[in-house]
Amino acid sequence: FPQDRPFEDTCHGNPSHYYDKAVRRCCYRCPMGLFPTQQCPQRPTDCRKQCEPDYYLDEADRCTACVTCSRDDLVEKTPCAWNSSRVCECRPGMFCSTSAVNSCARCFFHSVCPAGMIVKFPGTAQKNTVCEPASPGVSPACASPENCKEPSSGTIPQAKPTPVSPATSSASTMPVRGGTRLAQEAASKLTRAPDSPSSVGRPSSDPGLSPTQPCPEGSGDCRKQCEPDYYLDEAGRCTACVSCSRDDLVEKTPCAWNSSRTCECRPGMICATSATNSCARCVPYPICAAETVTKPQDMAEKDTTFEAPPLGTQPDCNPTPENGEAPASTSPTQSLLVDSQASKTLPIPTSAPVALSSTGK
């Protein structure tokens, strides 16, 4: 089209723009390493950093790993997008008891309202079932239809929860079981006997609890016994031990009857953000042994930025380019500023001997 020619010509003399025939207009040329957010970018703000698959660009313009929903009790709510993380939620029939960023750290099965109570609000992915006392005239044993039926095949019968009485409300929520395959299998073997005075065949109200063993003769060891991978917490509840299954974690102490497993970052890494009994974010230890550092003389007085290397690698201990900028990286690890200025040293703790100091002692 002849009328388009002048527009095309205006682009040729401008290296920061190009002509897009499909849309018949001048477009802004994104700088190397940046990618357009639309077909024909008009300005620098229409360009963005491109992250690797399963990473997204966070508010601080950093490529950050999307959370994974690979646990059995989680499902994907929203996918990993270029500018937002994947979001996970508890699978149907479960609710989140301990939330985590864009996910849930711990899911429990929804409670079934016990005799004398009816469902006030059904459970959701975020909230447990809320029960309230049945209206007068309803038989307590059949206050809710579920309590008058044997579980049909294909459904997971729930453990009868211990009622909770909040001070401010007559309604109550009752967590039932830990959200693991183990818990599901255990739950499927249980049946409720709402009217039976005996506790035989009735599951414990604690998540992860298995029936207590009778005391061995002459033994005082009659403690509550939790299922494998659960421990008895200070409040006497069976609680799931943390898992060290992430690639960057190793087991520090095992799951015991009265204490959780604890995890730590594998050797060569340091915990940048902790979590209960574990580390939420491990990063490669960002400082090289003093004797491996090479520093050109013209950089002796400069601050240098090192990017912590991706998981599974060690810092290469070489300074970054002359401008002191770290190379762009899509690694989720945190970058750390290095100041080359030498200073006096503190001594080593007797309880923690370390490698040679820079003095060679």
């Epitope: 550092v293 200073s343 503190l346 080593i348």
Partner: nanobody, 122 residues
Framework: EVQLVESGGGLVQPGGSLRLSCAAS????????MAWYRQAPGKGCELVSI???????YYTDSVKGRFTISRDNSKNTLYLQMNSLRAEDTAVYYC????????????????WGQGTTVTVSS
Amino acid sequence: EVQLVESGGGLVQPGGSLRLSCAASGFTDDGPDMAWYRQAPGKGCELVSIISADGRTYYTDSVKGRFTISRDNSKNTLYLQMNSLRAEDTAVYYCAPDPRRNCRGGDCCGNWGQGTTVTVSS
């Protein structure tokens, strides 16, 4: 036994400055790396900065250019100079010896000292 005592915290307005100190005792001759960690209310323990035995220093992105870590062997003391403070810097700050060895688990807050509280609020 290694003992660390943190001090210097307080209430400061956004944009203000504080200097934290960590007095160390129970050490032998040479200098390990030392670290500052912090724990905000309801959050996990977070690495802030490391200083190596030979004085090289490391900072997390969020404090880069605002905080300065230093050490003085003659006084057996570690410092953290905090400038341009923000509300998100509100936390209890802890120092930790030899983080390469001691801070692989999520337990580098409160293991050696009681910490010092920094509150940034207008």
